[in-house]
């Protein structure tokens, strides 16, 4: 057959859906690969064709849109399952074509089983709440487009296995779940189950997300350098190993890049000729405040090295700080000779 | 002082009328705690003398009435056996003129002052009156565009205005008014509410509508030929499958051998907003086994059926 622009298997979109629930999957061509949308393509006379390859098979086959109760159907650029079955797992391809143009992309779809407590292999999105920050809300995700706005679904929220009822500081409000004061004890997996009717049938959508309570912006400070500091002097003899830790505390800041680096005589270690290595370790507190340690190491320090300026720098969205390490050459103890 | 600071969203209030704010913050206030109110980080607590215009009443701060100069940040400190929380509430007071159309929109009204009625439904508005037990509220009067609401579609029940069969005309500016009595003195409370109407949304355009058939029966003589159209409206750019089924099987498959009942070729007429599709089912010869069986027209997720019936005997 004639050539087709094949975008291959789009593994960026590892789509996971729950078994026995409706799923609507948009053809990724219009989302990520083509400049025009489905309506433009359709009005230009292009046809969208779907097919799939079952799990552990090589054979591409057309999708059967003539199943009982229209279990699988297509609407515009959306592939609908009402509902999914476990053996719908596979690689799905959508192809846009007419006699002169062709473009296609494949993506993996995994139908996942869940237990009665909503545990499953599903990768969970993480929603961060600021600790003790006032009222914050999470919203039941990815339910748009499943039912019209005239349908009033029933929404039930769970924390782990427990229905959220009479919780002290967590209040279900339809599609939203409100946290009056987020505390560490609110960390966990939260599930909304949306139940809606369609054509005499009742469908359930299960959405689980992980809530992580993090440091509040009102408590955030610029980076704090704990080491080096004025109380520690790195006194070495030539030939000894020089180890200087730079330990920096970063308040949690949403979407902030935390950086730590050393300069030696104002230059980055890579830009100077001395044999220096830097090892980094990172630890986090329960509220995702971060402590980064970069250890500068010179295996055999020379007297020249001991005269250099060693400065630790740190930067976050809150600001930039720097601190010089106190490095000096150890004065040899005087030798007394007995005449 | 070791107190944890908690910041509440701003409250926007109107001058010259009572206002109260309750310092409760579950789970903090669920145990044995003491609550003290302060203004603008002052070290002196708000008075507890009930004759004071601004005073603390149990866990509440009460303004009788609120005045323009009362804007500011108020703190309530909740002390437990081994905890302390300081809650900051930013109160902004403005002069409101509900019936002065020259005044622009109110600044960032909270949800209590923006409410929704649903078109075609029996719905309600709520008058949010949050005051301590020491305040006695009289019956509530409701106004729309500055006129008292009268009429059989409206009923006042407790703090609710019940609205029957909501129409588009019910959108607009409402106010609820109540007389509050405290220590023998009377004050007027007037809350403005901006009401919008949500339309009765159709099926987002993506669910096809079957115009005919309508889940009904058709009288037809045994042995005759019958053609029934399924008429469907759908969006211009839909990709829905339209077909006839019996016993959950496509009629062309179900009658594959005899070909006695067949699905016709689909045609469509294009309109400005939608397409009208027609796909027929042809019974070359109606047999006894066809009676009482639902023949289903499917269009995407929509379905409708016909059932063939023997005509009633004519005894003339």
């Amino acid at each position: 057959s004639e050539r087709c622009d094949d975008w291959g298997l789009d593994t960026m979109r590892q789509i996971q859906v729950f078994e026995d629930e409706p799923a609507r999957i948009k053809c990724p061509l219009f989302e990520h690969f083509l400049k025009f949308n489905y309506s433009t393509a359709h009005s230009a006379g292009l046809t969208l064709i779907w097919y799939w390859t079952r799990q552990d098979r090589d054979l591409e086959e057309p999708i059967n849109f003539r199943l009982p109760e229209n279990r699988i159907s297509k609407e515009k650029d959306v592939l609908w399952f009402r509902p999914t079955l476990l053996n719908d797992t596979g690689n799905y391809t959508c192809m846009l074509r007419n006699t002169t143009y062709c473009s296609k992309v494949a993506f993996p779809l995994e139908v996942v089983q869940k237990d009665s407590c909503f545990n499953s292999p599903m990768k969970l999105p993480v929603h961060k709440l600021y600790i003790e920050y006032g009222i914050q809300r999470i919203t039941c995700p990815n339910v748009d487009g499943y039912f019209p706005s005239s349908v009033k679904p029933t929404i039930t929220w769970y924390m782990g296995c427990y229905k959220i009822q009479n919780f002290n500081n967590v209040i279900p409000e339809g599609m939203n779940l409100s946290f009056l004061i987020a505390l560490i004890s609110n960390n966990g997996n939260y599930t909304c189950v949306v139940t809606y009717p369609e054509n005499g049938r009742t469908f359930h959508l299960t959405r689980t997300l992980t809530v992580k309570v993090v440091g509040s912006p009102k408590n955030a400070v610029p980076p704090v350098i704990h080491s080096p500091n004025d109380h520690v002097v790195y006194e070495k003899e030539p030939g000894e190993e020089l180890l200087i830790p730079c330990t920096v505390y970063f308040s949690f800041l949403m979407d902030s890049r935390n950086e730590v680096w050393w300069t030696i005589d104002g230059k980055k270690p890579d830009d100077i000729t001395i044999d220096v290595t830097i090892n980094e370790s990172i630890s986090h507190s329960r509220t995702e405040d971060e402590t980064r340690t970069q250890i500068l190491s010179i295996k055999k320090v020379t007297s020249e090295d001991l005269k250099r300026s060693y400065v630790c720098h740190a930067r976050s969205a809150k600001g930039e700080v720097a601190k010089a390490a106190k490095v000096k050459q150890k004065v040899p103890a005087p030798r007394y000779t007995v005449e | 002082d070791g107190c944890k600071d908690i910041f509440m969203k701003n409250e926007i209030l109107s001058a010259s009328q009572p206002f109260a704010f309750n310092c409760t913050f579950p789970p903090i206030t669920s145990g044995e705690v003491s609550v003290t109110w302060y203004k603008n980080s002052s070290k002196i607590p708000v008075s507890k003398i009930i004759q004071s215009r601004i005073h603390q009443d149990e866990t509440w701060i009460l303004f009788l009435p609120m005045e323009w100069g009362d804007s500011g940040v108020y703190q309530c400190v909740i002390k437990g056996r081994d905890s302390c929380h300081r809650i900051h509430v930013n109160l902004t007071v403005f002069e409101k003129h509900w019936c002065d159309t020259s005044i622009g929109g109110l600044p960032n009204l909270s949800d209590e002052y923006k409410q929704i009625l649903h078109l075609g439904k029996d719905d309600s508005l709520t008058c949010h009156l949050h005051f301590p037990k020491s305040c006695v509220l009289g019956p509530i009067k409701w106004y729309k565009d500055c006129n008292e609401i009268k009429g059989e579609r409206f009923t006042v029940l407790e703090t609710r205005l019940l609205v029957s069969n909501v129409s588009a005309e019910d959108r607009g500016n409402y106010a609820c008014q109540a007389i509050l009595t405290h220590s023998g003195k009377q004050y007027e409370v007037l809350n403005g509410i901006t009401v919008s109407i949500t339309e009765r949304a159709g099926y987002g355009g993506s669910v096809p509508k079957i115009i005919y058939p309508k889940n009904h029966s058709i009288e037809v003589q045994l042995g005759t030929t019958l053609i029934v159209d399924c008429n469907v409206t759908d969006t211009k750019d839909n990709t829905n499958l339209r077909c006839w089924r019996v016993n959950n099987t496509l009629v062309d498959d179900y009658y594959d051998e005899s070909k006695r009942i067949r699905e016709g070729v689909e045609t469509h007429v294009s309109f400005r907003e939608h397409n009208l599709y027609t796909v027929n089912i042809t019974f070359l010869e109606v047999k006894m086994e066809d009676y009482g069986l639902p023949f289903m027209c499917h269009a995407g997720v929509s379905t409708a059926y016909i059932i063939l019936q023997l005509p009633a005997p004519d005894f003339r």
């Epitope: - | 439904k121 029996d122 309600s124 059989e152 609710r160 019940l162 029957s164």
Partner: antibody, heavy 118, light 107 residues
Framework: EVQLVESGGGLVQPGRSLRLSCAAS????????MHWVRQTPGKGLEWVSV????????AYSDSVKGRFTISRDNAKNSLYLQMNSLGTEDTALYYC???????????WGQGTLVTVSS | EIVLTQSPATLSLSPGERATLSCRAS??????LAWYQQKPGQAPRLLIY???NRATDIPARFSGSGSGTDFTLTISGLEPEDFAVYFC?????????FGGGTKVEIK
Amino acid sequence: EVQLVESGGGLVQPGRSLRLSCAASGFTFDDYAMHWVRQTPGKGLEWVSVISWNSDVIAYSDSVKGRFTISRDNAKNSLYLQMNSLGTEDTALYYCAKGHNWNFFDYWGQGTLVTVSS
Amino acid sequence: EIVLTQSPATLSLSPGERATLSCRASQSVSSYLAWYQQKPGQAPRLLIYNVANRATDIPARFSGSGSGTDFTLTISGLEPEDFAVYFCQQRSNWPLTFGGGTKVEIK
């Protein structure tokens, strides 16, 4: 054609619970408030409870407050009345009724009989 | 709560006669009053709402009047099927309340 069909009534001992259901058809269920009304030979008609279309407004008569709970499932076109701590004074024919102008009743079911007796 | 008192308790009339039923409220219910008809073994049926509006499919011989605390249901010419019990009901205040009923019987 509007139809309201109650179920769940029966003989129950004092202090026990019962759940009544009402299946609605023939109208757009989630446009209207729904009510429970009961009737006894001695006390005549007595309004029990109301629930708005979206369950936002709920009210009870003083005689059942704290013991009865009204609820609805618009997806199933169903109205419910959970009755706890039943007493002999709750013996009645229970009707479910569709709200008209909110708090009039333009359609009624045929009723389900609840008898509380030891 | 608002108490509705109906009178008379029983009204004995012949077919074709005019029936006048009264309902008095313990406090004003404005125009929020309805009338229902109930026949033995059947559920009540809405006749009149908001004092004077006839419900769907209710014949013109049924009419309502009054305001505030005093209300009247009039049946201009009794038909055989009109012999039943009639209740009034208010929706001005919670709890919603009914009158005790007036029985219209054949004389």
